[in-house]
Amino acid sequence: CKAMHVAQPAVVLASSRGIASFVCEYASPGKATEVRVTVLRQADSQVTEVCAATYMMGNELTFLDDSICTGTSSGNQVNLTIQGLRAMDTGLYICKVELMYPPPYYLGIGNGTQIYVIDPEPCPDSDF
């Protein structure tokens, strides 16, 4: 296994609809044709997997049907979007990239993006 640098933004604020997007960029040492991207959430020293996708270069990034993540790839960049976030989902979201093919296998782990999620205040009843 060889180490690889992965860059991602330090902080992202989710929209009022609970959607957060960020770019995960990896420094590929060669021309990878099969890449696996995983988003991990770290909170209270616990690490959980949010979503993952394996894709072939030039093809769409496909997450499972029930995944809260969507994404697109362009070169060595992956544009990730996480949906359905609530205030309780605030935490550090880490991008992990694995170059599966061709050999050698590379693993890169970003420093994480702190995603802040603020639940919208319910609209007060208005009299007309």
Partner: nanobody, 119 residues
Framework: EMQLVESGGGLVQPGGSLRLSCAAS????????MGWYRQAPGKQRELVAD???????NYADSVKGRFTISRDGAKNTVGLQMNSLRPEDTAVYSC?????????????WGQGTQVTVSS
């Protein structure tokens, strides 16, 4: 924790065929590179073949055209079909899995199965 169990080794004559199988326990089979290494007595361990989750394969030059690796996601198994076997293919063949578990890189190994090519 993933466990790998190999089967299918044995004694075969030169020019013969053998099929090795590796069964993986655990639910991380689909995200790991799976493959085979071999080690002959007094020699260094060498990669034979491996296969990615996407089905891309990689072979040692010495086995290209003779060996075929495959994976069955439904059964969590990796197979190695070995044809036109030669005496120099005699070795202990070990299944391996390489990938990552959360923030850690992992490599798992099977216990190995003996393949002997002799007349």
């Amino acid at each position: 924790e993933m466990q790998l169990v190999e089967s299918g080794g044995g004694l075969v004559q030169p020019g013969g065929s053998l099929r090795l199988s590796c069964a993986a326990s655990g639910n991380i089979f689909s995200r790991y590179i799976m493959g085979w290494y071999r080690q002959a007595p007094g020699k260094q361990r060498e990669l034979v073949a491996d296969i990615t989750p996407g089905g891309n394969t990689n072979y040692a030059d010495s086995v290209k055209g003779r060996f075929t690796i495959s994976r069955d996601g439904a059964k969590n198994t990796v197979g190695l079909q070995m044809n036109s076997l030669r005496p120099e293919d005699t070795a202990v063949y070990s299944c391996y899995a390489r990938g990552s578990d959360k923030l850690l890189m992992r490599t798992y190994w099977g216990q190995g199965t003996q393949v002997t090519v002799s007349s």
